[in-house]
């Protein structure tokens, strides 16, 4: 259904354009598979315009359909590394609030050292996105190899 | 920070929507790892609306945050080809002006024959993007296997 | 070329924002390589805002440049599965009308169990997109592993 005619005549700022691109800060302690992210111009080419970070996890501030994308590269990795440590899996999901918990995007490193994907998904204000990396392998912190972002697409 | 109220009431044309999708033209001579791109309706489904090509490299015409995406497939490739010629790596970066030179996106072909990824990044008018393919393997020129594009997302 | 000044002053609804994200419904009968998709809030996080499904294939309702993205994961898959059944290839293309038939995006599963990519492409009202999976392997129907979507980007 098209959103109401009146709404569309508002200035574009009120329609959204929330966007964030994050770089890896650190991995979690043992038993915590989450990756912890950081963003901001002081750090390089990462940024948050709208969404916020909550203890290294991305929190959404505006309802809408978002394009979520991620790339994770394993550090000091060859195809034998990846296959020996199989299954190493990356999952992006809503981890909070608990009532909306769901896996949105999942990829395994088989004989590869990088996964990259993207998808469209509805997100709501307050949704926190977590990126879980199973296994014991360490992801690269190079900003051109590992990154995670969202882009507001429409209401 | 939200962009100024006055700016948002301008016609949409002034807000951007710059977009380009390119197909591979040729690889560089020896010692030049760059891929050379081409675009335009006469060539098929490639196009440039805003950005321009400068000797086969993509030059940005409008400041903003862009979604950059790429897929490169190696020609006549099997998983043994890719692993034998390891490391074959594709990097997308700002190569000019030199003061802004940086790698934005990097992926290796381990046992695979295709890499594909995307990311959000700030780009400025005059930035030229280069795509460097290390190694001796030849990329496919098929337009559904190898392509490179950018999409303006917001100021 | 910039689209006409008059058009840009129309309400945003008339400019598009068509978007769809689909989940796998079923595979075709033998000799039919197409994947059949479904979408709608009752099914989970899939949706169609503008485009429609025609017998499980996605039909475009608005001319424009679209970002097309896909991820397909093979069921019960390991790197040996993928390499033993090589070539298993996923192609996204315009399959109807026949006069506009073309492959837009093609990827092979070499030693991997997931392919994921995206590209910008012009699409016209009435174009139907088909996703063909060659070979005999079964794709996963998990909604975080296999999905297909389009996003209208500009006229």
């Amino acid at each position: 259904q098209r959103f109401a005619q009146a709404q569309q005549q508002l200035p574009l700022e009120s329609l959204g354009w929330d966007v964030a691109e994050l770089q890896l800060n650190h991995t979690g302690p043992q038993q915590d598979p989450r990756l912890y992210w950081q963003g901001g111009p002081a750090l390089g080419r990462s940024f948050l315009h709208g969404p916020e970070l909550d203890k290294g996890q991305l929190r959404i501030h505006r309802d809408g359909i978002y394009m979520v994308h991620i790339q994770v590269t394993l550090a000091i990795c060859s195809s034998t590394t990846a296959s020996r440590h199989h299954p190493t899996t990356l999952a992006v999901g809503i981890c909070s609030p608990a009532s909306r918990s769901i896996s949105l995007l999942r990829l395994s490193f088989h004989q590869g050292c990088t996964i990259a994907s993207q998808r469209l998904t509805p997100l709501a204000r307050g949704d926190t996105l977590c990126t879980n990396l199973t296994g014991t392998l360490l992801p690269s912190r190079n900003t051109d190899e590992t990154f995670f972002g969202v882009q507001w697409v429409r209401p | 920070q939200r962009f100024a109220q006055a700016q948002q009431q301008l016609p949409l044309e002034s807000l951007g929507w710059d977009v380009a999708e390119l197909q591979l033209n040729h690889t560089g001579p020896q010692q030049d790892p760059r891929l050379y791109w081409q675009g335009g309706p006469a060539l098929g489904r490639s196009f440039l609306h805003g950005p321009e090509l400068d000797k086969g490299q993509l030059r940005i015409h409008r400041d903003g945050i862009y979604m950059v995406h790429i897929q490169v497939t190696l020609a006549i490739c099997s998983s043994t080809t890719a692993s034998r010629h390891h490391p074959t790596t594709l990097a997308v970066g700002i190569c000019s002006p030199a003061s802004r030179s940086i790698s934005l996106l990097r992926l290796s072909f381990h046992q695979g024959c295709t890499i594909a990824s995307q990311r959000l990044t700030p780009l400025a008018r005059g930035d030229t993007l280069c795509t460097n393919l290390t190694g001796t393997l030849l990329p496919s020129r098929n337009t559904d296997e190898t392509f490179f594009g950018v999409q303006w997302v917001r100021p | 070329q910039r689209f006409a000044q008059a058009q840009q002053q129309l309400p945003l609804e008339s400019l598009g924002w068509d978007v769809a994200e689909l989940q796998l419904n079923h595979t075709g009968p033998q000799q039919d390589p197409r994947l059949y998709w479904q979408g709608g809030p009752a099914l989970g996080r899939s949706f169609l805002h503008g485009p429609e499904l025609d017998k499980g294939q996605l039909r475009i309702h608005r001319d424009g440049i679209y970002m097309v993205h896909i991820q397909v994961t093979l069921a019960i898959c390991s790197s040996t599965t993928a390499s033993r059944h090589h070539p298993t290839t996923l192609a996204v293309g315009i399959c109807s009308p026949a006069s506009r038939s073309i492959s837009l995006l093609r990827l092979s599963f070499h030693q991997g169990c997931t392919i994921a990519s995206q590209r910008l492409t012009p699409l016209a009202r009435g174009d139907t997109l088909c996703t063909n999976l060659t070979g005999t392997l079964l794709p996963s129907r998990n909604t975080d592993e296999t999905f297909f979507g389009v996003q209208w980007v500009r006229p």
Partner: nanobody, 126 residues
């Protein structure tokens, strides 16, 4: 809801063969795939093979590739599992399951399969 009834289990010597069968009844219009799982004593249930309901697409666990073949008989509405070159480690209860409900994945490989048979015991002696 589907009703699934397995048959064909039994005792067989290593290197021998068995053919399991699963009779499917009920509304199959939303069924995506049929699978065989197995559970060895003291171990988790694992997927062995799967076949698409609407076509001939299949997938197998690495441990059974080249030895087991899953097939579907449309006329009889049955799904079979031909097991050759059996090994003692193939011992376990074999379950037929139907994937009719869409979901996101979980760590448990049985996720998404909501209709199950009672199981049939396969014992491979050395």
């Amino acid at each position: 809801q589907l009703q699934l009834v397995e048959s064909g289990g039994g005792l067989v010597q290593a290197g021998g063969s068995l053919r399991l069968s699963c009779a499917v009844s009920g509304r199959t219009s939303s069924t995506y795939a049929m699978a065989w799982f197995r559970q060895a004593p003291g171990k988790e249930r694992e997927i062995v093979a799967v076949i698409g309901w609407s076509g001939g697409r299949t997938a197998y666990a690495d441990s059974v590739k080249g030895r087991f073949t899953i097939a579907k008989d449309n006329a009889k509405n049955t799904v079979s599992l031909q097991m050759n070159s059996l090994k003692p480690e193939d011992t376990g209860v074999y379950y037929c399951a139907a994937d009719s409900e869409q979901s996101s994945s979980s760590e448990g490989q049985a996720y998404g399969y909501e209709d199950w048979g009672q199981g049939t015991l396969v014992t491979v002696s050395s």
